[in-house]
Amino acid sequence: QIGHPSPPPEKKELRKVAHLTGKSNSRSMPLEWEDTYGIVLLSGVKYKKGGLVINETGLYFVYSKVYFRGQSCNNLPLSHKVYMRNSKYPQDLVMMEGKMMSYCTTGQMWARSSYLGAVFNLTSADHLYVNVSELSLVNFEESQTFFGLYKL
Amino acid sequence: QIGHPSPPPEKKELRKVAHLTGKSNSRSMPLEWEDTYGIVLLSGVKYKKGGLVINETGLYFVYSKVYFRGQSCNNLPLSHKVYMRNSKYPQDLVMMEGKMMSYCTTGQMWARSSYLGAVFNLTSADHLYVNVSELSLVNFEESQTFFGLYKL
Amino acid sequence: QIGHPSPPPEKKELRKVAHLTGKSNSRSMPLEWEDTYGIVLLSGVKYKKGGLVINETGLYFVYSKVYFRGQSCNNLPLSHKVYMRNSKYPQDLVMMEGKMMSYCTTGQMWARSSYLGAVFNLTSADHLYVNVSELSLVNFEESQTFFGLYKL
């Protein structure tokens, strides 16, 4: 983790925490994430098919950043959503969302980030995901595109 | 601190926390920060030559905002990085990064912010810094440009 | 809360926390917020006339996101501020602020978000508010525009 091994966790420090980074072989929605290598954290939360699975009800700070870029700007509308799914409920619930329109000069190389972060009351078995409107415009560098949470 | 003196800290509340604000009279990288006056916080973490020095291993939420602005837009590529250095490791590690290209209308007065924030497992003696691609375009108002962290 | 009722809070979990969402009948500054329905949280903090009222001195992470959009871009300068007011002090204190200028192509439909988040030492009876420069350009969807905090 960050260039050095994790310290042995103290008993009290079994924090519910995750920090997942961009995975460039994502081909479909929701986005998939690197959950093993690099500056990744995953403790007391499970990762399954793009989603963070809550296993303890409580308050969580949830965040995500997505880095969009392209070779030639055509101002395709961009959206970045963090949403929640639970088998007890029929519909996805959008927790946080960012949208961009008319954000670059036509024809130019462009780059832009979207950041989301807030507190939510989550229930055991909730699955959290990230969705974007245009996968081909996402850059998946670990420092640029990420998804995480921690239990307060 | 925010217009009123800090309360006497309770014994349990020796929180590892920092909130540093922009310091305008510097031309060096990494960015230097105001660590004394205004809405600054620094407790259980040291500040040294632009860096926050971790003295207790654990999980930290780290954040930074930088406010870029200019009088006449030429779309100079902008980057904003939070990176980590530790004497045991040869290379800086970029923890979070934001980039902007083609973000304003040529010739116009412009302004834009970059925000970064995420959880990391940090080790005692890690030094955290903020870097930008163009110092001349940063505005250092305390409410606009800042760097902070807290131990979970 | 997020599509399912809150669990009965455990004794220890009386967290000071708030997450308020956009309220479209805001007509004046500061912004007003939805404090009851949807993905709202309000515990150990009071909501009063657009403001979050602190009732326990300590360290808080405070955040806000505002979603601006318009039908026809004229690059009206945008600002988004989180500020603090306390009856003991004569003036509002701007804690965090984001500004945008020259951010879209003249005449086009446009959309952009501003995100702020940082740690502050707050005192009992502090009132926190959000201000924007142009209310008519704010979209108040609950996932897009919000204001929150939690005590560390």
């Epitope: - | 009279n25 510097s26 031309r27 590529p77 691609s133 163009e134 001349s136 | -």
Partner: antibody, heavy 119, light 111 residues
Framework: EVQLQQSGPELVKPGASVKLSCKAS????????ISWVRQRPEQGLEWIGW????????QYNENFKGKATLTTDKSSGTAYMQLNRLTSEDSAVYFC????????????WGQGTTLTVSS | DIVLTQSPASLAVSLGQRATISCRAS??????????IHWYQQKPGLPPKLLIF???HLESGVPARFSGSGSGTDFTLNIHPVEEEDAATYYC?????????FGGGTKLEIK
């Protein structure tokens, strides 16, 4: 509008010193470097050094150490370059230019001051 | 010091045609983020004017017929289509390290 207005032409004798000025306007003087560049007759461009008006820090090209001294007056938004122990080799056009701190490109230039060193 | 070598020293190009100027650095002037090469135009009796920064970015107000490319040690300035007013001397400059240095210049004549 960003402008750099340089002082007029100078004719000085060998061995003397001269102080050239560059008055900046239209931007925040303390947020950008001011660089100085020499151009000898029919020759290319040589970077002399920069000064950061924010804190007065300077950096010189080794070839000009001891020859050039850079200073600023923040109150008037003026940068100065003093050249000492002048010889005919110092005859040139001297430009000041605003330079971005990190990218270090020269995005606005003064009109130039012609220095002639002759007895 | 990083030495920048421009070629050719001079060239003559017909109106409407393409002018290509090369700038070679004695060592790399690129990082993982940017290439620290800038291009200037200078006309007689006037100061230089910034055209291209960071190898490929067009300065505000500069016509789109100017373009820059390259990375590492090899960089190119292209002008297409060349116009009468482009007759000038062109310089590359690096800002990868101190001291900043300029290329020797390329004089463009319009035929």
């Amino acid at each position: 509008e960003v402008q750099l207005q340089q002082s007029g032409p100078e004719l000085v004798k060998p061995g003397a010193s001269v102080k050239l000025s560059c008055k900046a306007s239209g931007y925040t003087f303390t947020r950008f470097d001011i660089s100085w560049v020499r151009q000898r007759p029919e020759q290319g461009l040589e970077w002399i050094g920069w000064i950061f008006p924010g804190d007065g820090s300077t950096q010189y090209n080794e070839n000009f150490k001891g020859k050039a001294t850079l200073t600023t007056d923040k109150s008037s938004g003026t940068a100065y370059m003093q050249l000492n122990r002048l010889t005919s080799e110092d005859s040139a056009v001297y430009f000041c230019a605003r330079s971005l701190i990190s990218t270090a490109m020269f995005d606005h230039w003064g009109q130039g001051t012609t220095l002639t060193v002759s007895s | 010091d990083i030495v920048l070598t421009q070629s050719p020293a001079s060239l003559a190009v017909s109106l409407g045609q393409r002018a290509t100027i090369s700038c070679r650095a004695s060592k790399s002037v690129s990082t993982s983020d940017f290439s620290y090469i800038h291009w200037y135009q200078q006309k007689p009796g006037l100061p230089p004017k910034l055209l291209i920064f960071l190898a490929s970015h067009l300065e505000s107000g500069v016509p789109a017929r100017f373009s820059g490319s390259g990375s590492g040690t090899d960089f190119t300035l292209n002008i297409h289509p060349v116009e009468e007013e482009d007759a000038a001397t062109y310089y590359c400059q690096h800002s990868r390290e101190l001291p900043r240095t300029f290329g020797g210049g390329t004089k463009l004549e319009i035929k």
